[in-house]
């Protein structure tokens, strides 16, 4: 009555598991199993994960922590979140770069490399979607530029240049002879 009851120790629940001779309480996230409990329903001896290692979940049998991943510099990856005792390093791309998956069915754990985002301004185009999870999506040509082939060409500044039909429609004047 009053106060919280400790979890029942039946070896079948989430809190206690048979480790060695007895049902033992598991180790919390960020800790590994040094030695199992020495009495029924006792606490195992748990130690904090050493530097550069982690365990993300409560566990009963892990006698060592997982090594933190190193972000792949060759793939231009950077650490978005450093490794802690309870979480692995989170690798990603620096601002101005986007994730290009190295496999077709891309999931969070898939290998990837970082690609520089397209600079729509340098291509004289509007930015339609900013670059984050995928490359920048560039839109139509900026004012003063018209579509020519794959690129944007600057409107002529004098009557000497040629101005095809698309140029005339965007730049607002026709070629003069």
């Amino acid at each position: 009555q009053g106060g919280t009851r400790s979890p029942r120790c039946d070896c079948a629940g989430d809190f206690h598991k048979k480790i060695g001779l007895f049902c033992c309480r598991g180790c919390p996230a960020g800790h590994y199993l040094k030695a199992p409990c020495t009495e029924p329903c006792g606490n195992s001896t748990c130690l904090v994960c050493p530097q550069d290692t982690f365990l993300a979940w409560e566990n009963h049998h892990n006698s060592e922590c997982a090594r933190c991943q190193a972000c792949d510099e060759q793939a231009s990856q950077v650490a978005l979140e450093n490794c802690s005792a309870v979480a692995d390093t989170r690798c990603g791309c620096k601002p101005g770069w986007f994730v290009e998956c190295q496999v077709s069915q891309c999931v969070s754990s898939s290998p990837f490399y970082c690609q520089p985002c397209l600079d729509c301004g340098a291509l004289h185009r509007h930015t339609r979607l900013l670059c984050s999870r995928r490359d920048t999506d560039c839109g139509t040509c900026l004012p003063g530029f018209y579509e020519h082939g794959d690129g944007c060409v600057s409107c002529p500044t004098s009557t000497l240049g040629s101005c095809p039909e698309r140029c005339a429609a965007v730049c607002g004047w026709r070629q003069m002879f």
Partner: antibody, heavy 123, light 111 residues
Framework: EVQLVESGGGLVKPGGSLRLSCAAS????????MSWVRQAPGKGLEWVST????????YFPDSVKDRFTISRDNAKNSLYLQMNSLRAEDTAVYYC????????????????WGQGTLVTVSS | DIVMTQSPDSLAVSLGERATINCRAS??????????MQWYQQKPGQPPKLLIY???NVESGVPDRFSGSGSGTDFTLTISSLQAEDVAVYYC?????????FGQGTKLEIK
């Protein structure tokens, strides 16, 4: 019929090593925790080590921790005790015993014992 | 560690009489309503033999003149009618927590 037969005892100098064996028969060896208990000449019983059944975790009192290791080979129905850095006070008859678990209370009692093997540590 | 203390250290009883051996634990050996302790008999030149488990349960094959009682920290082994073959040293032992510990033993003789 359950049988436990120890071997490997003998005379060894202080600081020396010895490996005891226990051959088990008459029961499903892999399903039981197993223990070593010793008895110095004219003295009482002292628990030395236990190894669990499934995951083979080992347990020791402080008096032998870091000097003794316990292991098992379920395929050979055998239990072992590797004793290193032996001291005069380790002189004893070493018994191998089966640990029977009773009910769901995680309660063990040593229900079968071998005849023992004598270890003498002396220079 | 749990210390197990037996009394008396030695005991002489006439054949057919009752023999009583006591064992006290330095802390409770109860768990989940069960006393995690047992009694062993060791005859000269032989290994120990399990007589009683969980304080009061007689191991199969053990004569019914042997009985155990008690709970918590205080336990008793009783031989209701002593027989010649009962001459031995008797040990209590706890399995409540590691390290497992034994009493120092009680030597039972015939008066």
């Amino acid at each position: 019929e359950v049988q436990l037969v120890e071997s490997g005892g003998g005379l060894v100098k202080p600081g020396g090593s010895l490996r005891l064996s226990c051959a088990a028969s008459g029961f499903t060896f892999s399903s039981y925790a197993m223990s070593w208990v010793r008895q110095a000449p004219g003295k009482g019983l002292e628990w030395v080590s236990t190894i669990s059944d499934g995951d083979s975790y080992s347990y020791f009192p402080d008096s032998v921790k870091d000097r003794f290791t316990i292991s098992r080979d379920n395929a050979k129905n055998s239990l072992y005790l590797q004793m290193n850095s032996l001291r005069a006070e380790d002189t004893a008859v070493y018994y191998c015993a089966r640990d029977r678990i009773y009910g769901s209370v995680q309660y063990y009692a040593m229900d079968y014992w071998g005849q023992g093997t004598l270890v003498t540590v002396s220079s | 560690d749990i210390v197990m203390t037996q009394s008396p250290d030695s005991l002489a009883v006439s054949l057919g009489e009752r023999a009583t051996i006591n064992c006290r634990a330095s802390e409770s050996v109860e768990f989940s309503g069960t006393s995690l302790m047992q009694w062993y008999q060791q005859k000269p030149g032989q290994p120990p033999k399990l007589l009683i488990y969980a304080a009061s349960n007689v191991e199969s094959g053990v004569p019914d003149r042997f009985s155990g009682s008690g709970s918590g920290t205080d336990f008793t082994l009783t031989i209701s009618s002593l027989q010649a073959e009962d001459v031995a040293v008797y040990y209590c032992q706890q399995s409540r927590k590691l390290p497992y510990t034994f009493g120092q033993g009680t030597k039972l003789e015939i008066k």
